[in-house]
């Protein structure tokens, strides 16, 4: 969380951003909030990116003002217009690109003052893994697949019964480049699994950490997966 305070002029206002990550090819949100004003006409929101000459986005007098917008963001940005009046300056970024990573500034002017805060935005690819029993294999085998990751992640297997065990000798992980030549499909196979045990396939890079769990008993198979973004720090 980054909290910035205004400088000079009327009194300063508090602006708060949260470091976040964007999943390339999907829509992302750069989060920014500020002390609300009661009238829309005096609120100005400017998003800037370090190293970029033009603006990322500008909203003033109740409208988008995009005449100074940088070419790389053309047609890809929007504020949540109905939420501006309650202090939400967050920016929706469409079709996140790898090159969108960097330091952004959320700069706010209201009738009460000015303020700004920086935000670190990481970009990459992350997806939920799915763990299945591989019935084609000769021994009891689990297969963990996740369709899109970047940068290349690490894959670690764990088991509820054999806690702390190292499965690197009995697992094999491969990375297959997807058609757009950036993201990769992650496939990890775990051999010699035992019944009545819960196994976890953990995939992690510097942006996200995802886990796929599978519990195999004689009567049923239970699956669960979750994904967590790393380094969501407020500022």
């Amino acid at each position: 969380l980054i909290i910035g305070f205004g400088i000079s002029g009327r009194h300063s206002i508090t602006v708060t951003t949260v470091a976040s990550a964007g999943n390339i090819g999907e829509d992302g949100i750069l989060s920014c909030t500020f002390e609300p004003d009661i009238k829309l006409s005096d609120i100005v929101i400017q998003w800037l990116k370090e190293g970029v000459l033009g603006l990322v986005h500008e909203f003033k007098e109740g409208k988008d003002e995009l005449s100074e917008q940088d070419e790389m963001f053309r047609g890809r940005t929007a504020v949540f217009a109905d939420q501006v009046i309650v202090g939400n300056a967050s920016l929706r970024l469409k079709n996140v690109q790898l090159t969108d990573a960097g330091t952004y500034k959320c700069y706010i002017i209201t009738s009460k003052g000015k303020g700004n805060a920086n935000l670190e935005y990481k970009t990459g690819a992350f997806s939920m893994p799915e763990v299945n029993v591989d019935y084609n294999a000769s021994s009891e085998t689990l297969r963990c697949e996740a369709p899109r990751w970047f940068p290349q992640p690490t894959v670690v297997w764990a088991s509820q019964v054999d806690q702390g065990a190292n499965f690197s000798e009995v697992s094999n992980t491969s990375f297959e480049l997807n058609s757009e030549n950036v993201t990769m499909k992650v496939v990890s196979v775990l051999y010699n699994v035992t019944i009545n045990n819960t196994y976890s396939c953990m995939i992690e890079n510097d942006i996200a950490k995802a886990t796929g769990d599978i519990k195999v008993t004689e009567s049923e198979i239970k699956r669960r997966s979750h994904l967590q973004l790393l380094n969501s720090k407020a500022s």
Epitope: I38, K39, I85
Partner: antibody, heavy 117, light 107 residues
Framework: QVQLVQSGAEVKKPGASVKVSCKAS????????MHWVKQAPGQGLEWIAA????????DYNQKFKGKAKITAVTSTSTAYMELSSLRSEDTAVYYC??????????WGQGTMVTVSS | EIVMTQSPATLSLSPGERATLTCKAS??????VAWYQQKPGQAPKLLIS???YRYTGVPDRFSGSGSGTDFTLTISSLEPEDFAVYYC?????????FGGGTKVEIK
Amino acid sequence: QVQLVQSGAEVKKPGASVKVSCKASGYTFTSYWMHWVKQAPGQGLEWIAAIYPGNSDTDYNQKFKGKAKITAVTSTSTAYMELSSLRSEDTAVYYCTTTVAHYFDYWGQGTMVTVSS
Amino acid sequence: EIVMTQSPATLSLSPGERATLTCKASQDVSFAVAWYQQKPGQAPKLLISSASYRYTGVPDRFSGSGSGTDFTLTISSLEPEDFAVYYCQQHYNTPLTFGGGTKVEIK
């Protein structure tokens, strides 16, 4: 859930003052503007003023400057509006209302102030 | 100050009919308009914020549209509980101002 509970009805003599309270709960009182709105009998709605309890910033409708004074006590999450030099035209229902997720999304139940000799 | 003019002042309709309420601002207010419903003895209730965003729990027969100076609240098919007074309000500039209200009454 968000609630705004106002003080009870008041009957006052011309020239007197009255202080209406509005106790907020269910949200962070210091983070959102609190407004006061007047509705005279059979009439429409009229914005009086607003206060931002986080730093006590206020914004008044010029028409009500000198008539209304608004304050907020953050320790009790209560906003107040004092009306001075009361006249018959101040007879009205006064509402407190806040803007949490949308403009004027929560309202108090209203306080009837009657000015009569 | 920005003047909000509502029309008509009264709308006499039967349940099931469509109601169209209009609100005109004396200057451009972008999308900064909200609509409220008020019944006798009650506080106003928010229906539509920022010209077209239906507030949580508001039935989808209520819809708002417009930007700039001309705004509309539409009730697609009136239910008995919809007969009330409706106000528009701008939050583009201070003083915040309301329209004079439109009373929707049973024909």
